[in-house]
């Protein structure tokens, strides 16, 4: 089973972006981490992005004020991936 | 200024296939979900499909699932959608529209008649 | 599935408002907070006026506002002009497909 985020949080949050941050997993086997913004009530995410497994800290810029944001983050391994931890912030 | 141009389209026989393209410029294609919406003529809008900025989220209308297939390639700029077992019913106008909270951007048009 | 329904005409004189209903049938696994609507004349392709049920792209008149209530969906456009006479659809998530639902479209006319 691929482990999975446990203390994903907000910082820094303004109108455009959210900032997010967590305690990188201490795994070999871990690729990295799969960010997806998707706009509550919508179907896909409207943003996308992957980062390191030493990074712990990423600022989802270009959001639009006022909506609620479902913001998941998914960590990589080579052939698998965890289920999403995910939060709820409006801009 | 942002931009998408639908090529492609035409005249094909039932049965037959075509590959449309989105030409995206003026923004980060990458960055966003891309959609194929279709318009008979004289009638309303129809969704046909989705695919998400790295493509790794992808859905169909039911109406097309099995014979239409969505892509796309980040590092042209375009968005593609091959359409295979076309029927009479097919034949629409096609658009490509971003995905932002709503189809903020959609482009022209390109016309598919399937016809014997 | 979702369905969205809309009349099929509207019509109003210049300076009048009118709204624009759009009723969400059927579970929708809450893809109905984000009903955007758009604009289509005849020939053009169509162009978004309001998205997440009320809000505003930069360069969309004020004269077009969006609500929601219960089920219904609604676009008013106040101050009728001539240019207003187009198509309006209504649109949405089903998020059990999942998939992007239209409504049937509205034709509005503006009199005179």
């Known amino acids: 089973e691929v482990p999975q985020l446990t203390d994903l949080s907000f910082v820094d949050i303004t109108d455009s972006s959210i900032g997010l941050r967590w305690t990188p997993l201490n795994s070999s086997t871990i690729i990295g981490y799969r960010i997806t913004v998707v706009a509550a009530g919508e179907g896909i995410p409207i943003f996308e992005d992957f980062v390191d497994s030493s990074v712990g800290y990423y600022t989802v810029t270009g959001l639009e004020p006022g909506i609620d944001y479902d913001i998941s983050v998914i960590t990589l391994i080579n052939g698998g991936e965890s289920a999403p931890t995910t939060l709820t912030q409006q801009t | 200024q942002v931009q998408l141009v639908e090529s492609g389209g035409g005249l094909v026989q039932p049965g037959g296939s075509l590959r449309l393209s989105c030409a995206a410029s003026g923004f980060t294609f990458s960055s966003y979900g891309m959609h194929w919406v279709r318009q008979a003529p004289g009638k309303g809008l129809e969704w046909v499909s989705v695919?998400?900025?790295?493509?790794?989220?992808?859905y169909y209308a039911d109406s097309v699932k099995g014979r239409f297939t969505i892509s796309r390639d980040n590092s042209k700029n375009t968005l593609y959608l091959q359409m295979n077992s076309l029927r009479a019913e097919d034949t629409a106008v096609y658009y490509c529209a971003r995905n932002k909270v709503g189809f903020d951007v959609w482009g022209q048009g390109t016309l598919v008649t399937v016809s014997s | 599935d979702i369905a969205l329904t809309q009349p099929a005409s509207v019509s109003g004189s210049p300076g009048q408002s009118i709204t624009i209903s759009c009723t969400g049938t059927?579970?929708?696994?809450?893809?109905?907070?984000?009903v955007s609507w758009y604009q289509q004349h005849p020939g053009k392709a169509p162009k978004l006026m309001i998205y997440y049920v009320h809000k505003r792209p930069s360069g969309v008149s004020n004269r077009f506002s969006g609500s929601k209530s219960g089920n219904t969906a609604s676009l008013t456009i106040s101050g009728l002009q001539a240019e207003d006479e187009a198509d309006y659809y209504c649109q949405s998530w089903d998020l059990l497909a999942p998939s992007v639902v239209f409504g049937g479209g509205t034709k509005l006319t503006v009199l005179g």
């Open positions: 059927s579970s929708d696994g809450g893809g109905y907070n984000t």
């Open positions: 695919i998400s900025s790295s493509g790794s989220y992808i």
